[in-house]
């Protein structure tokens, strides 16, 4: 019997300083580019190696970005969201939603790979 997959959702404020090659991540989403079903939010699709976001370490692929410098990202066209990031300045504050997958196995069941002690 397979366990149920649940998600632990947390929010975090991440302050990034734009590096020599910018913020160092890509986004998907927007009202004209729904990447997640029934959700026009903005999501992180890629983090550039050695970029500002990667060096900070907190932003993860799959994170939903709720706001940039206090500006809500709801109901934005994709390109408008891109422009918002590109024009956000040197110090950029991101409000981010992390979604951590949690596997809940059936009670009393020990998986094959689990330690026995």
């Amino acid at each position: 019997m397979n366990g149920r997959v649940d998600y632990l959702v947390t929010e975090e404020e991440i302050n990034l300083t734009r590096g020599p090659s910018g913020l160092g991540f890509n986004i998907v989403g927007g009202t004209d580019q729904q990447y997640v079903s029934n959700d026009s939010g903005i999501y992180v699709s890629r983090i550039k190696e050695n970029g500002a976001a990667a060096l900070d370490g907190r932003l993860q692929e799959g994170d939903k970005i709720l706001s940039v410098n206090g500006q809500d990202l709801k109901n934005l066209l994709h390109q408008d969201a891109v422009d918002l990031f590109r024009n956000a300045g040197y110090a950029v504050s991101l409000r981010v939603q992390h979604r951590l997958q949690v596997q809940n196995g059936p009670i009393g069941h020990r998986g094959e790979g689990d330690p026995s002690g």
Epitope: P20, S45, V82
Partner: nanobody, 127 residues
Framework: QVQLVESGGGLVQAGGSLRLSCSAS????????MGWFHQAPKKEREFVAE????????GYTDSVKGRFTISRDNAKNTVYLQMNSLKPEDTAVYYC?????????????????????WGQGTQVTVS
């Protein structure tokens, strides 16, 4: 996973035109930023142009502005590079590239590290 196939290269005289095409596999083509790079013999691969997935924002390296135009047809999973007023220094192998999503940084910063998927390249020779 995206697979890219370029076509349209060839030999052309200075001042002439070519249109390169890049056909992409994959169901979510409109979510990808597409780019063109070129690589001359014994030189590094250099950014030429890019176009965003939805909304189609474009960016160009200074040396091709006003001469090259990047465009895309999301219904055909294809990106194009129209190259006009070609110069001998445009001679290179031209590579199509793709990356999921849109970079939050301006194309002034673009390098090959910003793209994950690459075609095999098509040779452009300007005599």
């Amino acid at each position: 996973q995206v697979q890219l196939v370029e076509s349209g290269g060839g030999l052309v005289q200075a001042g002439g035109s070519l249109r390169l095409s890049c056909s992409a596999s994959g169901r979510t083509f409109s979510s990808y930023t597409m780019g063109w790079f070129h690589q001359a013999p014994k030189k590094e691969r250099e950014f030429v142009a890019e176009i965003g997935g939805t909304g189609g924002g474009t960016g160009y390296t200074d040396s091709v502005k006003g001469r090259f135009t990047i465009s895309r047809d999301n219904a055909k999973n294809t990106v194009y590079l129209q190259m006009n007023s070609l110069k001998p220094e445009d001679t290179a192998v031209y590579y199509c590239a793709a990356v999921i999503g849109s970079p939050t940084d301006s194309s002034d910063y673009r390098s090959s590290l910003d793209f994950d998927y690459w075609g095999q390249g098509t040779q452009v020779t300007v005599s």
